[in-house]
């Protein structure tokens, strides 16, 4: 006879799994809010700022009724990967003015990376179809000026905050449907 079977594999409780993802997302939302406020204090935004390379908004009040876990997690992961790339770019190419946002920007990058790994784990634990590997994204052009870097920072942090805000609400809603 072969070796005795190992302990029975306990299937994860999807609600508990989602709970911990919500906690991480909320925590990152608070971090992003603080960093965006810090940026506004140091470099007040004159009006709204957009960056064409940022993902388009995925959620709104109207979309909540049709939310499904695989779609939400896949889309959220894709959007957050894009924001991670933008934060990395900002730290590398944002110019000396944005160095005043360190080490907070580095901490945000690390926590964003952690949330992405958490989402990946959640998708595999819930046996959701894994998204195909991300195609290599075209490199982001460096800002044309110091002010261009600051405007990009406003757009990136504002967009990330909005994405995380809706993510918390969407994940909370999905938890009730499990």
């Amino acid at each position: 006879p072969g070796p005795p079977p190992g302990p029975p594999r306990v299937s994860p409780d999807p609600r508990a799994e989602l709970d911990s993802t919500v906690l991480l997302t909320r925590s990152l939302l608070a971090d992003t809010r603080q960093l965006a406020a810090q940026l506004r204090d140091k470099f007040p935004a004159d009006g709204d700022h957009n960056l064409d390379s940022l993902p388009t908004l995925a959620m709104s009040a109207g979309a909540l009724g049709a939310l499904q876990l695989p779609g939400v997690l896949t889309r959220l992961r894709a959007d957050l990967l894009s924001y991670l790339r933008h934060v990395q770019w900002l730290r590398r190419a944002g110019g000396s003015s944005l160095k005043t946002l360190e080490p907070e920007l580095g901490t945000l990058q690390a926590r964003l990376d952690r949330l992405l790994r958490r989402l990946q784990l959640l998708m595999s634990r819930l046996a959701l179809p894994q998204p195909p590997p991300d195609p290599p994204a075209p490199p982001l052009a460096p800002p044309s000026s110091a002010w261009g870097g600051i405007r990009a920072a406003h757009a990136i942090l504002g967009g990330l905050h909005l994405t995380l805000d809706w993510a918390v609400r969407g994940l909370l809603l999905l938890k009730t449907r499990l």
Partner: antibody
Framework: EVQLLESGGGLVQPGGSLRLSCAAS????????MNWLRQAPGKGLEWVGV????????FYADSVKGRFTISRDNSKNTLYLQMNSLRAEDTAVYYC??????????WGQGTLVTVSS | QSVLTQPPSASGTPGQRVTISCSGS????????VNWYQQLPGTAPKLLIY???LLPSGVPDRFSGSKSGTSASLAISGLRSEDEADYYC???????????FGGGTKLTVL
């Protein structure tokens, strides 16, 4: 700085109509769901309705369904509330507010609507 | 009659800690985020707490929120005279498909 400025309030007779506007500035208006809320004199807050960032979806409180319509013009950064078949109980200060998720993070200063004969 | 239930009034002396409760049901507080708003006399409401316990920028950490089951509470420590205002809790309601509020609590600083 985020700013929301309501206008269009005033005195109207029962059964009449009124259109409120909310001019937004200081943020990318087309990225945010927008709401109307109201507060009757000396009373609490009441949510009126919400419109999604692109205008494709709208939800209303039961008390105004079929009488009020929310719309928006993203090219003008403006939110609207068309109020028809007004009743005395619609008398209130009307606020527009921005929604980034489940909450209202910025509010306008409000505009007073009085429905009376 | 408000969907969420709050005490109509609360009071405290400067420096004290006060708590305002908000109770609902599984279709609102139980399943959704709770938010709190402060309305100073004669002004528009202002967001005070969101997603149960998060503070927006500019709100002092004397304010805190918590939630358990179908109830939530707002705590204010180190009470100040400028905290005298109306406080409202709010949540999305799945049954009504809309946002619901508590009736508001008038806080008096004695």
């Amino acid at each position: 700085e985020v700013q929301l400025l309501e206008s269009g309030g005033g005195l109207v007779q029962p059964g009449g109509s009124l259109r409120l506007s909310c001019a937004a500035s200081g943020f990318t208006f087309s990225h945010y769901d927008m709401n109307w809320l109201r507060q009757a004199p000396g009373k609490g807050l009441e949510w009126v309705g919400v419109i999604s960032y692109d205008g494709s979806n709208k939800f209303y409180a039961d008390s105004v369904k079929g009488r009020f319509t929310i719309s928006r013009d993203n090219s003008k950064n403006t939110l609207y509330l068309q109020m028809n078949s007004l009743r005395a109980e619609d008398t209130a200060v009307y606020y527009c507010a921005r929604t980034p998720g489940s909450h209202f993070d910025y509010w306008g200063q409000g505009t007073l609507v009085t429905v009376s004969s | 009659q408000s969907v969420l239930t709050q005490p109509p009034s609360a009071s405290g002396t400067p420096g004290q800690r006060v708590t305002i409760s908000c109770s609902g049901s599984s279709s609102n507080i139980g399943n959704n985020a709770v938010n709190w708003y402060q309305q100073l006399p004669g002004t528009a409401p202002k967001l005070l707490i969101y997603y149960d316990d998060l503070l927006p920028s500019g709100v002092p950490d004397r304010f805190s929120g918590s939630k358990s089951g179908t109830s939530a509470s707002l705590a204010i420590s180190g009470l100040r005279s400028e905290d005298e205002a109306d406080y409202y809790c709010s949540a999305w309601d799945d049954s009504l498909n809309g946002v619901v509020f508590g009736g508001g609590t008038k806080l008096t600083v004695l």
